[in-house]
Structures are given as structure tokens and as C-alpha cells.
């Protein structure tokens, strides 16, 4: 007889989750020599140990510490790129400017990007049917706690000038409730981080407003300044053109200063 399973509101664990995590780990360590010492089987064991057999609404950051320890990685100073509500563009940017790193360019972020996972209390099974939804079920679920844990660590280890890409098309360009607003901002270390530079990405082609004057950006500036970190803000009016010119700044259409 099939066992009774808790029904959650969110979608279940991504199919072939263990195989996907292991394959991603192997691929990552192959092309990042500084992580070649990592044993991917140990990484998977630590990942699995964080949520397997545990009640999926009672996961803690402590559960992920063995995994975090195995995935320890440093980003060169001035090369951290945070993002909020604009993941695709941030990732497109680090693909063409490979010396900059989002969390998903790091081993642990790369392993979990776009995946869902959860287990069940007292069984060694992975739940492929449903997982807790952050809003409808609980916030201390395996996925949310993972991202909170690794985002905190990513922010804590940043140094120099830290960059953040923000979505200028949203009503709240800076949202205090986003991972950036609730976790990363508060875990930047003033003794290591000289400045936060926000890049506000415009959506409309004809949008020439200075979105750095937006009230939510002023709120971000206030939070950052109170933490003794300098704040700068820049508008990126044409994200498509921006990516093109990042790739080849010598292109004649990019030399005009735009």
C-alpha cells in the first residue's frame, strides 16, 4: 500500500534531483580549477543530509552548514554581483563579463539554481509530489532556507565595491522583503565593503527617467549609509545594448558614451 504523504501547496522535488545535483557538481569542478579538490559525492551527501528525514517546515540554516563548509569559495574583491528580481539579465551579464560573479556562478548556487527539493519526516525518501510553498505553507522550507543561508554567506564574504542589479520596471525597485533587501543588504561587512553600486535596469525603450531618484532607491541608500558603506546608483537605459557593449566595447556604436 502506498504511504500517506503530506500534501503541500508547492510543486514537488525536481525530477532526477540527486542526479542533477551530482552532474552539476562534476561539471562545475571540471571547469573551475580552484574547486577541483571538491568531492562531489560528499557534496551530495551533505546536501541530502540537510533535508532528508526532516520535517520540511522545520529546516534551519544549521542544517546546511556541512554543505556550506564543503562549498566554501571566495570571490575576488570588486567582483560580486547581487541581483533582485532580474536574475536572467544578471546571469547574461556574468556570461559576457566572466570576471564577475552572481551567487549562481558559485558552486552552491550553481547546484541549486531553478531546482526544488524536500523530504519527509522520518523517511529517507525525496518528495517528488509536493513541497512547501513559502507563502501558503511555511517559510522554513528546504529551498527557502538554502537560499537564505547561501545568500547570507555570499554577502558576508563580499569585499571592495559590491554591485547589485535592480529591476527598474517593478513598482518597488528596491524591495525590503526580497532576498537582497532582507538578507544580503544586512550581511555586507562594512570593514570589507567600501561601497554598494546599484545598477537600475530600465524596461521601456523610451524610458529616460532617472530611476536612481526613486523613493525605494533612496530607502536603500539610507540603509546602506547607516551601515557605513558608501552608495552609488547608475541607470542602465538599454539593457540589450549594454550587454552588447560589455561584450565588445570597441564596437563603433558603443564608443559614443551612450
Amino acid at each position: 500500500l502506498p504511504r500517506w504523504r503530506q500534501q503541500w501547496s508547492g510543486s514537488g522535488t525536481t525530477s532526477r534531483f540527486p542526479e542533477t545535483v551530482l552532474a552539476r557538481c562534476v561539471k562545475y569542478t571540471e571547469v573551475h580549477p580552484e574547486m577541483r579538490h571538491v568531492d562531489c559525492q560528499s557534496v551530495w551527501d551533505a546536501f541530502k543530509g540537510a533535508f532528508i528525514s526532516k520535517y520540511p517546515c522545520n529546516i534551519t540554516e544549521e542544517d546546511y552548514q556541512p554543505l556550506v563548509k564543503l562549498g566554501t569559495q571566495t570571490v575576488p574583491c570588486n567582483k560580486t554581483l547581487l541581483w533582485s528580481r532580474i536574475k536572467d539579465l544578471a546571469h547574461q551579464f556574468t556570461q559576457v563579463q566572466r570576471d564577475m560573479f552572481t551567487l549562481e556562478d558559485m558552486l552552491l548556487g550553481y547546484l541549486a539554481d531553478d531546482l526544488t527539493w524536500c523530504g519527509e519526516f522520518n523517511t529517507f525518501e525525496i518528495n517528488y509530489q509536493s513541497c512547501p510553498d513559502w507563502r501558503k505553507d511555511c517559510s522554513n522550507n528546504p529551498v527557502s532556507v538554502f537560499w537564505k543561508t547561501v545568500s547570507r554567506r555570499f554577502a558576508e564574504t563580499a569585499c571592495g565595491v559590491v554591485h547589485v542589479m535592480l529591476n527598474g520596471s517593478r513598482s518597488k525597485i528596491f524591495d525590503k522583503n526580497s532576498t537582497f533587501g532582507s538578507v544580503e543588504v544586512h550581511n555586507l561587512q562594512p570593514e570589507k565593503v567600501q561601497a554598494l553600486e546599484a545598477w537600475v535596469i530600465h524596461g521601456g525603450r523610451e524610458d529616460s527617467r532617472d530611476l536612481c531618484q526613486d523613493p525605494t532607491i533612496k530607502e536603500l541608500e539610507s540603509i546602506i549609509s547607516k551601515r557605513n558603506i558608501r552608495f552609488f546608483c547608475k541607470n542602465i537605459y538599454r539593457p540589450d545594448k549594454f550587454l552588447q557593449c560589455v561584450k565588445n566595447p570597441e564596437d563603433s556604436s558603443c564608443l559614443s558614451g551612450i
Epitope: V31, H32, P33, E34, T74, P76, C77, K79, Q97, R98, D99, W199, K234, N235, I236, Y237, R238, K241, F242, C245, V246, K247, N248, P249, C254, G257, I258
Partner: antibody, heavy 127, light 108 residues
Framework: EVQLLESGGGLVQPGGSLRLSCTGF????????MSWVRQAPGKGLEWVAD????????YYADSVKGRFTISRDNSANTLYVQMNSLRAEDTAVYYC????????????????????WGQGTTVTVSS | QSVLTQTPSVSGTPGQRVTISCSGI??????VSWYQQLPGTAPKLLIF???QRLSGVPDRFSGSGSGTSASLAISGLQSEDEADYYC???????????FGGGTKLTVL
């Protein structure tokens, strides 16, 4: 025209010291990350040292670490390398070079290349 | 500190296409740049960021590759292309420049 002019080369005895200078023209020197690269007679290029735009970060090749010091005076648009405890194997033409950085829509990015080079100054270490 | 490996010499006749390889690039996130050094002169940047030509460099010069190897191709070879060519990469984790040993191009 963007250019770099080195000076200060010459003949020095082993164990001696020398300071090379490199002055930049035609670009905002303060914004530029700079490097020293050398070339021994008949050999290839060897990186020596690198300095950030404000001089707060310096990096050295293992072969010169502890003996050479890279520095800069942005008010004089000049880059320096102080070379102490010189050895015969330090004999080379020394080039200064500017790191390629570009502003893309006001965002300053490093392109990990040396886009402007000086003409070079010769250092001979011999007794 | 590691060195990038280049073929010591290549040759070609005018109009031909030659390729110079550079291997031993240590990280997928490092960019390769290529330099031309004409006899008795300072090096000159040709290619940056693996495959991007510096403005003013003829389109006969092209760069390719990333990850662990890169190459510089010169098509329509001309006598003035006779020079030493160097690849280089900045290691963003170790904060060091690494140069290839250089390739001497002879135009026959």
C-alpha cells in the same frame, strides 16, 4: 595621443638598486590600473608587477616579490618600480603598460588586457 | 607561477592563413589577450577577451576559444605580419598575469 614613456634604465651592479619611472599622457592616469612587464634579451615577455588605480592594491611575480616595489604618483601621472637586490637575471627591457578598462553606459569594466605600452627602458645588471 | 604554452614557431606564405595556439589556461573565467611584437618594438595589443579585436586592428586577425585553450588566426598573411606573438591571461583568483612563451611567425 595616448602614450607611456619609461625612463631610469641603465647599468647597475648585482645587489644594487634602480628606480624606473613611467609617465602617462593622453588618458586619465588616475583611472588606470598599471603594470610592469619585462623582456630578457632574446626571451619572451614576463609580467613583473601590477598596481590598482589608487595604489591600494599591488601584485607581484614570484621572481621579484620582496625585492621590487611598484608605486604611483597620480598627481604626476607617473608609475614607478623600485628595484632592489638586483640580480643578473633581472637584465631586461622593462615596459610599463596600461590595463584595458572601458566605461560601458557609465559602468567601468576591466577587460584583462594591456592596451597601451611604453617604448621600454633597458636595465643591465652586471659587474 | 604557470606559463601558457605556445607553439614556438610557425610560418606561411603571403595570402595564407596561419593559426597560433595557446594552451594551459587555468580557469574558465580567465580571458585571453593576444599581442604582436614587431622586431625591435614594444608589444601591441591585438585581441582582448578571447575574441574581441581592438579597434584599428585589421580583421585578418581573429581570436577564438575559452576555457582551457585559445588560438589566434591570421588570414591573408602579409610580410609585415612577421613578428613574435604572445598570448596572456590575468588570473582573477591569484592576481597574476601569465604569458605564453611566444610564437615566432615567419612569412616566407
Amino acid at each position: 595621443e595616448v602614450q607611456l614613456l619609461e625612463s631610469g634604465g641603465g647599468l647597475v651592479q648585482p645587489g644594487g638598486s634602480l628606480r624606473l619611472s613611467c609617465t602617462g599622457f593622453g588618458f586619465t592616469f588616475t583611472d588606470a590600473r598599471m603594470s610592469w612587464v619585462r623582456q630578457a634579451p632574446g626571451k619572451g615577455l614576463e609580467w613583473v608587477a601590477d598596481i590598482s588605480s589608487y595604489g591600494d592594491n599591488t601584485y607581484y611575480a614570484d621572481s621579484v616579490k620582496g625585492r621590487f616595489t611598484i608605486s604611483r604618483d597620480n598627481s604626476a601621472n607617473t608609475l614607478y618600480v623600485q628595484m632592489n637586490s638586483l640580480r643578473a637575471e633581472d637584465t631586461a627591457v622593462y615596459y610599463c603598460a596600461k590595463r584595458m578598462e572601458r566605461e560601458v553606459m557609465t559602468i567601468k569594466l576591466d577587460y584583462h588586457a594591456m592596451d597601451v605600452w611604453g617604448q621600454g627602458t633597458t636595465v643591465t645588471v652586471s659587474s | 607561477q604557470s606559463v601558457l604554452t605556445q607553439t614556438p614557431s610557425v610560418s606561411g606564405t603571403p595570402g595564407q592563413r596561419v593559426t597560433i595556439s595557446c594552451s594551459g589556461i587555468f580557469n574558465i573565467r580567465n580571458y585571453v589577450s593576444w599581442y604582436q611584437q614587431l622586431p625591435g618594438t614594444a608589444p601591441k595589443l591585438l585581441i582582448f577577451k578571447d575574441d574581441q579585436r581592438l579597434s584599428g586592428v585589421p580583421d585578418r586577425f581573429s581570436g577564438s576559444g575559452s576555457g582551457t585553450s585559445a588560438s589566434l588566426a591570421i588570414s591573408g598573411l602579409q610580410s609585415e605580419d612577421e613578428a613574435d606573438y604572445y598570448c596572456a591571461a590575468w588570473d582573477i583568483f591569484l592576481n597574476v598575469w601569465v604569458f605564453g612563451g611566444g610564437t615566432k611567425l615567419t612569412v616566407l
